[in-house]
């Protein structure tokens, strides 16, 4: 899978990074950058909607490890964490969108680094031509919601969202080209992942250029 | 029932040590938890001081720095403190305590047994 | 380090009366407060922790709330073994620390 980097990422002003993280790939968060040898305890909250909060926690004195309420075994420490503090998400579900917070004991009070994680999915994007001079362009089940948008503009109808259990929706826009003497329209899907750029040509097939899904990360 | 008692000089000379011991019954102190010092001023104000734990391993509080040490005697089931270069201001009733079981190893930093305190004065 | 300041600093009341006595935080602790009595001679009692969870042993008539910096010890329908000195302590990070104490007083 593909690794996640962390240039992706925005830090608030409290210090929580918002981090948004391709569905399949392999998350690596980090605690901050305290010496180890003034830790006395590192603890990782992970808060996921739905379900009770889980820690991972870790006692440096009595090099001892306890877990609450943690069950999903795709989050791990990267390693034992006198080694390495870091929490893996391997690989990333959908389920995984939440709030990671590393915490770190040490004699001089507790430091933070708290994680939002949007997990992202890459919407599968299909653009047709359903009557005449009438053209539909769907984006299948992304996260979040893709953006589309015509080159040239038509006369759309309203963009609708269809919301699924999983947090993924489609997003569907169909335009007509009445009036228009375009011969050729081009769908435009923007979304976190990667935009794609689709066309057709009206009362004719369907051709596709632009940027394929996961360019931008 | 966990029992903690104090005992040590009640009278210290500025400059000098002060050694205070905490003899714990109904328990034993490498099967489990924090001990720990702490001390009420005169006026009412507490501290805490430090910690070993069952392994025997130690934290202080970094204000106090290296004038603090916390050892422990595992034949007797005792733990110490001992303060160095004491002055006027360190005058108060010291106190050992445990601390309550941990369930996640942070945020469970409370005292659930303590002994009753013994006072100490620092005056030449 | 985490200042801890607690009020009133003495309190005078019937048995049988309510009380409160509040403890404010410099920062955000969350619910990690813990309250304490203590009482001359006799080894000082944990009875609540986490903000509001009562220790064992301790009776119902004690109840803690509060959340973030503000933080109330309430006794309800005090008995005459309530009296003495009520301390909070913050366990949410090293170093702890303790309020200034509060001294309950038969009125």
């Known amino acids: 899978g593909k690794q996640m980097t962390q240039n992706y990422s925005k830090m608030s002003a409290e210090g929580n990074i918002s981090q948004p993280v391709l569905m399949d790939t392999n998350a690596n968060l980090c605690c901050p950058p305290i010496e180890f040898r003034n830790l006395i305890v590192i603890v990782w909250e992970i808060i996921i909607r739905g379900q009770p909060s889980c820690t991972k926690a870790y006692r440096k004195e009595t090099n001892e490890t306890k877990e609450t309420n943690c069950t999903d075994k795709r989050i791990t420490w990267v390693s034992t964490p006198d080694q390495n503090s870091d929490l893996q998400i391997h690989p990333v579900a959908i389920t995984h969108d939440g709030y990671y917070r590393c915490i770190m004991a040490t004699p001089d009070g507790n430091f933070h680094r708290g994680y939002h994680l949007q997990v992202l999915v890459t919407p599968e994007v299909t653009l047709f031509q359903s009557r005449n001079r009438t053209a539909v362009c769907k984006a299948v089940a992304g996260k979040p919601a893709a953006q589309i948008s015509w080159i040239p503009a038509g006369d759309c109808a309203p963009t609708e969202h269809e919301y699924w259990g999983n947090g993924t929706v489609t997003v569907e826009s169909m335009c007509h080209w009445g009036d228009h003497n375009a011969s050729t329209v081009t769908c435009h899907v923007s979304h976190l992942t990667g935009n794609k750029s689709l066309y057709i040509k009206l009362n004719s097939g369907l051709r596709t250029s632009g940027s394929p899904a996961l360019d931008l990360l | 029932e966990i029992q903690l008692q104090e005992s040590g000089p009640g009278l210290v000379k500025p400059s000098q040590s002060l050694s205070l011991t905490c003899s714990v019954t109904g328990y034993t102190i490498t099967s489990g938890y924090d001990w720990s010092w702490i001390r009420k001023f005169p006026g009412n104000k507490m501290e805490w001081m430090g910690y070993?734990?069952?392994?025997?391993?130690?934290n202080y509080k970094p204000s106090l720095g290296s004038r603090i040490s916390i050892t422990r005697d595992t034949s007797k089931n005792q733990f110490f403190l001992q303060l160095n270069s004491v002055s006027p201001e360190d005058t108060a009733t010291y106190y050992c305590?445990?601390?309550?079981?941990?369930?996640?190893?942070?945020?469970?930093?409370?005292?659930?047994?303590w002994g009753p305190g013994t006072m100490v004065t620092v005056s030449s | 380090e985490v200042q801890m300041t607690q009020s009133p600093s003495t309190l005078t009341a019937s048995p049988g009366e309510s009380v409160s006595i509040n403890c404010k935080a410099s920062?955000?602790?969350?619910?990690?407060l813990a309250w304490y009595q203590q009482k001359p001679g006799k080894p000082n009692k944990l009875l609540i922790y986490?903000?509001?969870t009562l220790h064992s042993g301790t009776p119902s008539r004690f109840s803690g709330s509060g959340f973030g910096t503000d933080f109330t010890l309430t006794i309800r329908n005090l008995e005459p073994e309530d009296f003495g000195l009520y301390y909070c302590q913050q366990h949410h990070e090293y170093p702890l620390t303790f309020g200034s104490g509060t001294k309950l007083e038969i009125k």
């Open positions: 920062k955000n602790i969350r619910s990690y």
């Open positions: 305590a445990k601390y309550n079981e941990y369930k996640s190893y942070i945020y469970d930093w409370y005292f659930d047994f």
């Open positions: 070993i734990n069952y392994g025997g391993s130690t």
């Open positions: 986490s903000g509001s």
